[in-house]
């Protein structure tokens, strides 16, 4: 039993970081492996991460940690039974990944304005609750080719736009994504994707404009 | 809430033991260090040095670390500091101190034991 | 040891006032910086650990800064409960140690 690709790891920054790797063959890994991950520090513990199954030959950890510090550092040893297969080291702030935005919602009853809001993922407590950027999807169920990203570049987690920059009488659907410059993070997953129906009147004088062609 | 209980008040004599006890209401002890700090009056804060419940793991300040003996009972949640040869500028409040596993600030303290050397 | 130098050692100030307390360490300690308060015969409590992070519970007018030997806690605006002692700590090296104290009083 071999390790094909070495396990690399990504932290959310606050409670979680999941590892992924490649085994030679195929493998349960839940049964066959065990991930010993332990804080580089005085008097700290060593954890084991119990591996699940990500395809034939994949294996994925989620290594549960009580808080993140920029300074952390983590001594990982992949163990099938007694046989060390792999020894590494993971410092999560090196390798973030926020976690998704979640809540999404799509408010219309703002005359011709689309109001989207989704909720931080992080407590404020936490050191990215103020460091989130965002992007934010949007695209046609009927054309493929209408599909576009706006960034948000503030802190607050919402964006305006304007109903009749979409087309009219159609169904739209929206997702959102965070990063964190501070970090030079990854981009977080899509957050789940929301539905509306974009309706909107015409300024009269468009109306006038199209009885005349 | 995490609490932490100390033992009570304590007079000794110059060149004696003293042991304390600190209790915490924590599910899971061995997920914590349990450390020691004292207080003379009216002085600032000492490190004693810290225990990991869980494996025994123990570090001393070294200034302590022929007359200071830090142990636990995993079954009761409770740790104890024994600090041997007294004398008389040993009189102070004594604190433990719990931080998360391989932390290095004391998020709980315990109410103190004052403990008076006095011949 | 690392030697932690608290300036100023005492203060006065007025409710509502911005507080400033900064902590030199003898050498770099990778921001391993922590505050706490302390009350007269009560044990301390932990502010902020790791230079600027706010532990639980506590409220958002204090705030801590700094980086290498430097280091700062700010309270926004002085509230009557925090007439205290206010302690910094370095846990980056063996033996961990404490400044000497700043006593925050009622002008």
């Known amino acids: 039993m071999k390790v094909l690709q070495e396990p690399t790891c990504v932290s959310d920054y606050m409670s979680i970081s999941t590892c992924e790797w490649k085994m030679n063959g195929p493998t349960n890994c839940s049964t066959e492996l065990r991930l010993l991950y332990q804080l580089v520090f005085l008097l700290s513990e060593a954890h084991t991460c119990i591996p699940e199954n990500n395809g034939g030959a994949g294996c994925v950890c989620h290594l549960l940690m009580d808080d993140v510090v920029s300074a952390d550092n983590y001594t990982l040893d992949l163990w099938a039974g007694q046989q060390l297969l792999w020894k590494g080291s993971f410092k999560p702030s090196e390798h973030v990944k926020p976690r998704a935005p979640g809540n999404l919602t799509v408010h219309t009853n703002v005359s011709d304005t689309l109001l989207l809001t989704w909720s931080n993922p992080y407590p404020p407590d936490n050191y990215l609750y103020n460091h989130l950027t965002y992007a934010v999807n949007i695209w046609s169920e009927n054309d493929p080719a209408d599909f576009r990203i706006y960034n948000v570049t503030y802190l607050e987690p919402s964006l305006r736009i304007a109903a009749s920059t979409l087309k009219s009488g159609i169904s739209y659907r929206a997702r959102v994504r965070a990063w964190a410059q501070c970090y030079n993070t990854t981009w977080s997953e899509w957050s789940p994707s929301t539905k509306w129906h974009n309706s909107y009147r015409e300024p009269f004088e468009q109306h006038h404009h199209h009885h005349h062609h | 809430q995490v609490q932490l209980v100390q033992s009570g008040a304590e007079v000794k004599k110059p060149g004696a033991s003293v042991k304390m006890s600190c209790k915490a209401s924590v599910y899971t002890f061995t997920g914590y260090n349990m450390h020691w700090v004292r207080q003379a009056p009216g002085q600032g804060l000492e490190w004693i040095g810290g225990?990991?419940?869980?494996?025994?793991?123990?570090s001393y300040n070294q200034k302590f670390k022929d007359r200071a003996t830090l142990t636990a009972d995993r079954s009761s949640n409770t740790a104890y500091m024994e600090l041997s040869s007294l004398r008389s500028e040993d009189t102070a409040v004594y604190y433990c101190?719990?931080?998360?596993?391989?932390?290095?600030?004391?998020?709980?303290w315990g109410q103190g034991t004052l403990v008076t050397v006095s011949s | 040891d690392i030697q932690m130098t608290q300036s100023p050692s005492s203060l006065s100030a007025s409710v509502g006032d911005r507080v400033t307390i900064t902590c030199r360490a003898s050498q770099d300690i990778s921001n391993y910086l922590n505050w706490y308060q302390q009350k007269p015969g009560k044990a301390p409590k932990l502010l902020i650990y790791?230079?600027?992070r706010l532990h639980s519970g506590v409220p958002s007018r204090f705030s801590g800064s700094g980086s290498g030997t430097d280091y700062t806690l700010t309270i926004s605006s002085l509230q009557p409960e925090d007439f205290a002692t206010y302690f910094c700590?370095?846990?980056?090296?063996?033996?961990?140690?404490f400044g000497g104290g700043t006593k925050v009083e009622i002008k």
């Open positions: 101190a719990l931080t998360t596993a391989g932390r290095a600030w004391f998020a709980y």
């Open positions: 225990l990991h419940p869980g494996n025994g793991d123990t």
């Open positions: 790791y230079t600027s």
């Open positions: 700590q370095q846990g980056n090296t063996l033996p961990w140690t």
